[in-house]
């Protein structure tokens, strides 16, 4: 009955500091309310990057000031994290919680290593 969560091992952010990945979960039950949280793990410290609760069949809604956006389709969540810089390189973990109806289930992915390379500044043009 354990809930398994899958996510890619590595993702490279684009030149604008945006990284996208899919978080997929094998649901042991028929959930109608799901919470998805993106966590960043660095030096054994875990911090929340963003979180959204959604009703199955509806869109994910992150807070207005969130750096994340996403869409859902069945047991897949397509997550996009924006505004990343080189210092944000790290392991991003997808946590899925089936909040309703009972029973509650939680699953944690192994994490996606996101690499961010700051773009080189444009040379001055004479």
């Amino acid at each position: 009955k354990a809930m398994h969560v899958a996510q890619p091992a590595v993702v490279l952010a684009n030149s604008r500091g945006t990284a996208s990945f899919v978080c997929e979960y094998a649901s042991p039950g028929k959930a109608t309310e799901v919470r998805v949280t993106v966590l960043r793990q660095a030096d054994s410290q875990v911090t929340e990057v963003c979180a959204a609760t959604y009703m199955m069949g509806n869109e994910l809604t992150f807070l207005d000031d969130s750096i994340c956006t996403g869409t859902s389709s069945g047991n897949q969540v397509n997550l996009t994290i924006q505004g990343l810089r080189a210092m944000d390189t790290g392991l991003y973990i997808c946590k899925v919680e089936l909040m309703y109806p009972p029973p509650y289930y939680m699953g944690i992915g192994n994490g996606t290593q996101i690499y961010v390379i700051d773009p080189e500044p444009c040379p001055d043009s004479d």
């Epitope: 009955k1 354990a2 309310e33 966590l39 875990v46 946590k95 289930y105 699953g107 944690i108």
Partner: antibody, heavy 118, light 108 residues
Framework: QVQLVESGGGVVQPGRSLRLSCAAS????????MHWVRQAPGKGLEWVTF????????YYADSVKGRFTISRDNSKNTLYLQMNSLRAEDTAIYYC???????????WGQGTLVTVSS | EIVLTQSPGTLSLSPGERATLSCRAS???????LAWYQQKPGQAPRLLIY???SRATGIPDRFSGSGSGTDFTLTISRLEPEDFAVYYC?????????FGQGTKVEIK
Amino acid sequence: QVQLVESGGGVVQPGRSLRLSCAASGFTFSHYTMHWVRQAPGKGLEWVTFISYDGHNKYYADSVKGRFTISRDNSKNTLYLQMNSLRAEDTAIYYCARHGWLGPFDYWGQGTLVTVSS
Amino acid sequence: EIVLTQSPGTLSLSPGERATLSCRASQEVGESELAWYQQKPGQAPRLLIYGAFSRATGIPDRFSGSGSGTDFTLTISRLEPEDFAVYYCQQYGSSPWTFGQGTKVEIK
């Protein structure tokens, strides 16, 4: 630093009510799911109830369902446990615990003792 | 409900010895969803291991966790005087959240 402080325990007669509180500090309370766990004298740990970040979702152990109610006030950083129709078997130390980002109960209060006796 | 069974009930060992505690689940537990706690008399439980093998902040490396599926182990490589306590395993992957009945590690 993270701190959880329970209060409200005491001696109460069977059938009576009691409300426990857990004051949280040192973290953003509204971002975390919270739990109550109890421990009868000389016994092991028993999970009692859970409440989600916003208070929307609540789960209870079968042993307390219909008698206990968990709630939270995020503006006051406080977790509550309303215990009604108390029984002798509810006698225990009651701990509030924070549900960590990765799932385990990473911080616990010191506990408050509830004794149900006539 | 996932039932967790710990063995042995009591472990009598001397300081410096190795302690091996077992936790068996009645059904599969995701390896990311098993924790170990330590509890000393008169104190609240303290998180030692989460995700079956990750040490919590500030936990010395003599404590290690292993296992997957239904069988999990907590190992204390060399017992220190402060390690004599009761240890509980817990699954947190589904409700109801359940604990094992505990293993008491006592001084021989």
